[in-house]
Interface confidence: low
């Protein structure tokens, strides 16, 4: 493998063995430079498995506002605009990283936390269990 | 809003106005205790807008492995199992936070970074532009 030497400009760490706490720069670098901010803003309405977006706000978390998708129907919208219950609307979930203030109400110390969020919905063929 | 007093047990910070660099405890707290790890593992195949998952690996980032969804078709799968081009498969995208080593190869200093990932696909009615 390639030998990557330790950068001499690294901050000092009190415990060289195994840092439990690290320094994180909150000046967020955004890699999404050329993305259209409205990229999927109307998919929630146009989808055959439409969803509503619910605001989840927590001042002790960063980011403090997360939008959660909730599927509108158990079934999917068919070509006639009706709900077809032979298909299922299901949430697409993703684990994301957030920062949680710890101790609470501290402006400059956090703990990493993993949370599961529903990003949107998709229409799937149901799994049918046949009873013998 | 509710005034939350500053916790007297907070670590000292040099810049009380707005911490650009904060301390983060790396003992990750996982809130997804009761989630089924296979929760949406087969949706990518069962969806009417199926997708493939592509592995994006970067050892200098946390999480180092991110799975990116790529829709399999321009159209959606109809009841006969054929691709219907009167509908569109579109990616559902989400901005997520990741940590990147900064300076590179330092064990205990990071920068927050926002990246846009495609989590899955959904089937939408296309926007039809009528030419006068």
């Amino acid at each position: 493998g390639i030998t990557i030497p330790r950068n001499p400009g690294c901050p000092n760490s009190e415990d060289k063995n195994f840092p439990r706490t690290v320094m994180v720069n909150l000046n967020i670098h955004n890699r999404n430079t050329n993305t259209n901010p409205k990229r999927s803003s109307d998919y929630y309405n146009r989808s055959t498995s439409p969803w509503n977006l619910h605001r989840n706000e927590d001042p002790e978390r960063y980011p403090s506002v997360i939008w959660e998708a909730k599927c509108r129907h158990l079934g999917c919208i068919n070509a006639d605009g009706n709900v077809d219950y032979h298909m299922n609307s299901v949430p697409i979930q993703q684990e994301i990283l957030v920062l949680r203030r710890e101790p609470p109400h501290c402006p400059n110390s956090f703990r990493l936390e993993k949370i599961l969020v529903s990003v949107g919905c998709t229409c799937v063929t149901p799994i049918v269990h046949h009873v013998a | 809003g509710i005034t939350i007093p500053r916790n007297p047990g907070c670590p000292n910070s040099e810049d009380k106005n707005f911490p650009r660099t904060v301390m983060v405890n790396l003992n990750i707290h996982n809130r997804n205790t009761n989630t089924n790890p296979k929760r949406s593992s087969d949706y990518y195949n069962r969806s009417t807008s199926p997708w493939n998952l592509h592995r994006n690996e970067d050892p200098e980032r946390y999480p180092s492995v991110i799975w990116e969804a790529k829709c399999r078709h321009l159209g959606c799968i109809n009841a006969d199992g054929n691709v219907d081009y009167h509908m569109n498969s579109v990616p559902i995208q989400q901005e997520i936070l990741v940590l990147r080593r900064e300076p590179p190869h330092c064990p205990n200093s990071f920068r927050l970074e926002k990246i846009l990932v495609s989590v899955g696909c959904t089937c939408v009615t296309p926007i039809v532009h009528h030419v006068a």
């Epitope: 493998g1 390639i2 030998t3 990557i4 330790r6 195994f18 840092p19 439990r20 690290v22 990493l112 | 790396l26 003992n27 990750i28 690996e57 050892p59 200098e60 980032r61 946390y62 999480p63 180092s64 492995v65 940590l99 080593r101 064990p107 990071f110």
Partner: nanobody
Framework: EVQLVESGGGLVQPGGSLRLSCAAS????????MYWVRQAPGKGLEWVAE????????YYVSDVKGRFTISRDNAKNSLYLQMNSLRAEDTAVYYC????????????WGQGTLVTVSS
């Protein structure tokens, strides 16, 4: 699919030695720090040792320093832990873990190998 398979555990007398191995697959082994983690009966997980990508830097928890040696062979996608001067308190299930850039988070580990130190 990421897989980590440990081997080499067993029953050994105090003062004895064992060499644990871990075979890795499903990821770019040479790109990641690797770890040995252990869990003693009735206790929580304890980090034991870390080795950087190229093997040049190793870290140890204080009570194994000088007795345990972590090493790796990137050509074979393998991680090792040489354990000498074993003590009863080293009895535990030893896990090999794939490192992330965050040194306290292991996203994958194996099924573990039991090391019992007893006379």
């Amino acid at each position: 699919e990421v897989q980590l398979v440990e081997s080499g555990g067993g029953l050994v007398q105090p003062g004895g030695s064992l060499r644990l191995s871990c075979a890795a697959s499903g990821f770019t082994f040479s790109s990641y720090s690797m770890y040995w983690v252990r869990q003693a009966p009735g206790k929580g997980l304890e980090w034991v040792a870390e080795i950087k990508q190229d093997g040049s830097v190793q870290y140890y928890v204080s009570d194994v320093k000088g007795r345990f040696t972590i090493s790796r062979d990137n050509a074979k996608n393998s991680l090792y832990l040489q354990m000498n001067s074993l003590r009863a308190e080293d009895t535990a299930v030893y896990y090999c873990a794939k490192g992330e850039i965050l040194p306290l988070y292991f996203d994958y580990w194996g099924q573990g190998t039991l090391v019992t130190v007893s006379s």
